[in-house]
């Protein structure tokens, strides 16, 4: 955690770092470690990648324990093989308007991600890509035989875009806030970020919050009922304390997590809220971090690693964040 103790390095020599990740001396000058990357958690011992102009942003002077790797002010962004200047806006595709800010890209949808529930007029709603149209549109498959109305199919469930409009006009400032990014980890503690100018000076700034989609140790597939393919929001039996680099949350939380599917779908946060969580460290220091809390999850086929560089990320975003 800190550098007060003697140097203790893992027995094996230098670790093997993934491609593009620097091998650096830890912050104590003791051991060689793989540098933390943009948006990852960092500590004095776990430094950020200096070759990418990253530094460990502890958020406030009071908290010197755990930070987030952040690009220095004005750092450019590399997105889809193109370099964008900090402050530059661009359309990643016809579907998304993006902004680069100090090495982080925040994007907002240009297409509606509305849902449609079945009705007599549209018993089998589907979203489809129509020729010559950028955004998918709803089509209503009529039943083959109009006299036989079978059970309505489940509505096409994308994550929703409800809650306050992210674009507001306020005193000569067009307030824009991107959606929270997907959690950087599919299990365990990760980071979620967004870009906003919703502040007194109307300046773009990055915000980050801790997030946990599900605990890594939970074997959720065991809980899927016979005949079912998914467990969307598994019941958490007991309140838990969150752990963050050796520090433990002061309070216990009956948090909701997202489940899993056995049919290739992935379950991701659907509606979330952001709340402050206090962590107490072994040396007695207390620090406050914003954290994502899940209200509902959705299971869908738009899983990480799908074709579109941004779309697979976008569909895993947390919408409708409720304060």
């Amino acid at each position: 955690q800190n550098c007060s103790g003697p140097c203790r390095c893992p027995a094996e020599q230098a670790p093997r770092c993934p491609a593009g990740v620097s091998l650096v001396l830890d912050g104590c000058g003791c051991c060689r470690v793989c540098a933390k990357q943009l948006g990852e958690l960092c500590t004095e011992r776990d430094p950020c990648d200096p070759h990418k102009g990253l530094f460990c942003d502890f958020g406030s002077p009071a908290n010197r324990k755990i930070g987030v790797c952040t690009a220095k002010d004005g750092a450019p962004c590399i997105f889809g093989g193109t370099v964008y200047r900090s402050g530059e806006s661009f359309q990643s595709s016809c579907k998304y308007q993006c902004t680069c800010l100090d090495g982080a890209v925040g994007c907002m949808p240009l297409c509606s991600m509305d849902v449609r529930l079945p009705s007599p007029d549209c018993p089998f709603p589907r979203r489809v890509k129509l020729p010559g149209k950028c955004c998918e549109e709803w089509v209503c498959d009529e039943p083959k035989d109009q006299t036989v109305v079978g059970p309505a199919l489940a509505a096409y469930r994308l994550e929703d875009t409800f809650g306050p409009d992210p674009t507001m006009i306020r005193a000569n400032c067009l307030v824009q806030t991107t959606e929270w990014s997907a959690c950087s980890k599919t299990c365990g503690m990760g980071i979620s970020t967004r870009v906003t100018n919703d502040n007194a000076s109307c300046r773009l700034e990055k915000q980050s919050r801790l997030c946990m989609v599900r605990p890594c140790e939970a074997d959720l597939e065991e809980n899927i009922k016979k005949g079912k393919k998914c467990i969307r929001t598994p019941k958490i039996s007991k309140p838990i304390k969150f752990e963050l680099s050796g520090c433990t949350s002061v309070k216990t939380y009956r948090a909701k997590f997202c489940g899993v599917c056995t049919d290739g779908r992935c379950c991701t946060p659907h509606r979330t809220t952001t709340l402050p969580v206090e962590f107490k460290c072994p040396d007695g220091e207390v620090m406050k971090k914003n954290m994502m809390f899940i209200k509902t999850c959705a299971c869908h086929y738009n899983c990480p690693g799908d074709n579109d560089i941004f779309e697979s990320l976008y569909y895993r975003k947390m919408y409708g964040d409720m304060a």
């Epitope: 509606s112 509305d114 849902v115 449609r116 529930l117 079945p118 009705s119 007599p120 007029d121 549209c122 018993p123 709603p125 549109e137 709803w138 209503c140 109305v149 079978g150 059970p151 309505a152 489940a154 509505a155």
Partner: antibody
Framework: EVQLQESGPGLVKPSQTLSLTCTVS????????VHWIRQHPGKGLEWLGV???????DYNAAFMSRLTISKDTSKNQVSFKLSSVTAADTAVYYC????????WGQGTTVTVSS | ETVVTQEPSLTVSPGGTVTLTCRSS?????????ANWVQQKPGQAFRGLIG???NRAPWTPARFSGSLLGGKAALTLSGVQPEDEAEYYC?????????FGGGTKLTVLG
């Protein structure tokens, strides 16, 4: 963001025609139908009629003779006309989107009185 | 005239389970009635919770589930929260028109 907004006169004289407009944003009325529902003070909901995405209409049989629902797709607006109104038509009138009645307007209060 | 009947009021304790039902006067409710459930909280606008018998709207928590139960449409709330206190209306489709039920006032104790 999906929104529906009802507008029209708050006061209508008996025997006249009540005209309301539902202005829609965040979705297209050529993709979703729009329903009209009313609620008498302290009472439940009463379904009045619907204009479907393709322009067809269905009405509550009790209002068939005096209700007309139409739409202007270019303006994304649905209009509601109820003729020969009486005091019994005093209510809060709502428009709601088809598909689970998922989105509703805030409602507009209509009083029928001379 | 078709009548759709709901329990006028129900009371439940936080964390409990409650089932609201929607009965049709002309026979069993089926999937072709496209049962819808609409919620109104005090001082708030109406919003749809369930459409097409069992499909949840995106904002509808997983503790709400729609089904057909003994020839009636049913809305089951498991693990009831204080914020679930509201008026709930069902609406059934009859080939050419919808009919709303009289509504159920759900009270959450505590």
């Amino acid at each position: 963001e999906v929104q529906l907004q009802e507008s029209g006169p708050g006061l209508v004289k008996p025997s006249q025609t009540l005209s309301l407009t539902c202005t829609v944003s965040g979705f297209s009325i050529s993709t979703f139908g729009v329903h009209w529902i009313r609620q008498h003070p302290g009472k439940g909901l009463e379904w009045l009629g619907v204009i479907w995405r393709r322009g067809g209409t269905d009405y509550n049989a009790a209002f068939m003779s005096r209700l007309t629902i139409s739409k202007d797709t270019s303006k994304n607006q649905v209009s509601f006309k109820l003729s020969s109104v009486t005091a019994a038509d005093t209510a809060v009138y709502y428009c709601a989107r088809d598909g689970g009645f998922d989105y509703w307007g805030q409602g507009t209060t209509v009083t029928v009185s001379s | 005239e078709t009548v759709v009947t709901q329990e006028p009021s129900l009371t439940v304790s936080p964390g409990g389970t409650v089932t609201l039902t929607c009965r049709s006067s002309i026979g069993a409710v089926t999937t072709s009635n496209y049962a819808n459930w609409v919620q109104q909280k005090p001082g708030q606008a109406f919003r749809g919770l369930i459409g097409g018998t069992s499909n949840r709207a995106p904002w509808t928590p997983a503790r709400f589930s729609g089904s057909l139960l003994g020839g009636k449409a049913a809305l089951t709330l498991s693990g009831v929260q204080p914020e679930d206190e509201a008026e709930y209306y069902c609406a059934l489709w009859y080939s050419t028109h919808y009919v709303f039920g009289g509504g159920t006032k759900l009270t959450v104790l505590g």
